[in-house]
Interface confidence: low
């Protein structure tokens, strides 16, 4: 339960582009693996997955949200790095790229960091940023998806994620929680919520809420480790559970809703 930079030469979680250390090669993106079993699921998964630009390790079907219905929380946890950072750098890793939980149920966004120098009171900061685009709507507009993919390919930047990479000025940004040493402090917006940073730097929600959908950035700040990118992100999506979910997620069974 201890308090808990990205590899140089990789795309970081802030949309700041690529920076290359002369001695570090480019990293190959993690390949996508398809887990669905029917054509309808495959179409939905392809739509959703394609826009993740190689960041997922599992596919995911989805269904339009319906107000007032049960909900399923789909958490896409995307690693922003696959490389080892150079000497005296922080390497932040967001692992376990796919979670499914029920609304109001707990979820943990795993984040760990490694520091090449003595870990002297690094500060762990989890920030929330709203999506740059409506991910759910796009997942069910194949033409729009195709247009996006074509635009990405034409631009020669297949790693671009339109849901994550935009200026902070056009979306909501909040500090969720910070941890320094033994102490965890919640951001103003999250006061009263049962949220904490556990493990190395994992963000744990005792109960998820509709407003939790968005992109969560795990950042580790240290005065000693100045090189490398110190950030990775996870996408958290809250979707309505309808009868269609069983079709889109074969084998998925939703548990009871808890208040």
């Amino acid at each position: 339960m201890q308090q808990d930079g990205l590899g140089v030469g990789t795309r970081n979680g802030s949309g700041k582009g690529r920076s290359v250390h002369p001695s570090w090669p480019w990293c190959a993106p993690r390949p996508l693996r398809y887990f669905g079993r029917d054509a309808r699921a495959r179409r939905a998964q392809t739509a959703a997955m394609a826009l993740l630009a190689g960041g997922l390790s599992r596919g995911l079907g989805s269904h339009p949200a319906a107000a007032g219905r049960d909900a399923v929380v789909f958490v896409w946890l995307l690693l922003s790095t696959w490389c080892t950072a150079p000497a005296r750098a922080i390497q932040v890793t967001v692992s376990n790229p796919y979670h499914v939980v029920i609304l109001f149920q707990p979820v943990t966004l795993p984040c760990t960091y490694q520091m090449t120098s003595t870990p002297t009171q690094p500060i762990v900061i989890w920030k929330y940023k709203s999506f740059c685009r409506d991910r759910i709507a796009d997942a069910f507009s194949p033409a729009s998806v195709d247009n996006q993919l074509n635009a990405q390919l034409a631009a020669g930047n297949p790693g671009y994620n339109p849901y994550v990479e935009c200026q902070d000025s056009v979306r909501t940004v909040r500090v969720v929680a910070t941890k320094q040493g033994n102490a965890v402090t919640l951001g103003d917006y999250y006061q009263g919520r049962r949220i904490t940073i556990t493990g190395n730097a994992d963000l744990t929600f005792d109960q998820t809420a509709w407003g939790d959908s968005g992109v969560y950035y795990c950042s580790v700040v240290s005065a000693q480790d100045l090189q490398g990118n110190n950030e990775a992100y996870a996408e958290l999506i809250v979707l309505g559970r309808t009868s269609g979910v069983a079709e889109l997620l074969p084998g998925f069974q939703a548990g009871p809703i808890e208040d």
Partner: antibody, heavy 114, light 106 residues
């Protein structure tokens, strides 16, 4: 000043149960993980269990796993250790401690299982 | 368990170093604390936590450092009142672990 006051110790019977309570003051209780550490007479420190700031994450040492339950009440700034099926080897002084790399300790409460 | 010397001795004013090894990394990093116990059964006092952080009421002659999986407690200009047992502790994936303690004789 940070203070941690343990209570609930005393003479216990084998097979019975005990409930220890740690009352904290002087800091933002919900921001800190809390631990229980014990020390048998003439022995070293032994980690018993720990709980995260929100109470959502708990861990237990191998000697008490399955017998111990740690919980906390952030409103009351208390952390509780429930230990069941007591054994003679549970005898010792139980300390409440703040943080995972501990930065503050209580004075301890003595438990004797006999 | 953590490994530390059973005892060390020093004269007042000397510098003492106590090492602690055998800890496992916790999610890729090592986290150590040092705890002073002046008599058996008395409550420990933290002199170093989080590898090198010193509580505000602990004298500056106490310092901590880590190199890999080994932690070192350094007492610069040791004083008679520093005579005690010093116990190292760490936090691993499975939970907390302590060393058997090092008796410092001044």
């Amino acid at each position: 000043a940070v203070t941690l006051d343990e209570s609930g110790g005393g003479l216990q019977t084998p097979g019975g149960a005990l409930s220890l309570v740690c009352k904290a003051s002087g800091f933002d209780f919900s921001s800190y993980e809390m631990q229980w550490v014990r020390q048998a007479p003439g022995k070293g420190l032994e980690w018993v269990t720990g709980i995260s700031g929100s109470g959502s994450s708990t861990r237990y040492g191998s000697a008490v796993k399955g017998r111990a339950t740690i919980s906390r009440d952030n409103g009351q700034s208390t952390v509780r250790l429930q230990l069941n099926n007591l054994r003679a080897e549970d005898t010792g002084t139980y300390y409440c401690a703040r943080g995972s790399t501990i930065d503050a300790w209580g004075h301890g409460t003595e438990v004797t299982v006999s | 368990a953590l490994t530390q010397p059973a005892s060390v001795s020093a004269n007042p004013g000397e510098t003492v170093k106590i090492t602690c090894s055998g800890g496992s990394s916790y999610a890729g990093s090592y986290y150590y604390g040092w705890y002073q116990q002046k008599s058996p059964g008395s409550a420990p006092v933290t002199v170093i936590y989080y590898n090198d952080q010193r509580p505000s009421d602990i004298p500056s002659r106490f310092s901590g450092s880590t190199s890999g999986s080994t932690a070192t407690l350094t007492i610069t200009g040791v004083q008679v009142e520093d005579e005690a047992v010093y116990i190292c502790g760490t936090y691993e994936d499975s939970g907390g672990v302590f060393g058997a303690g090092t008796t410092l004789t001044v």
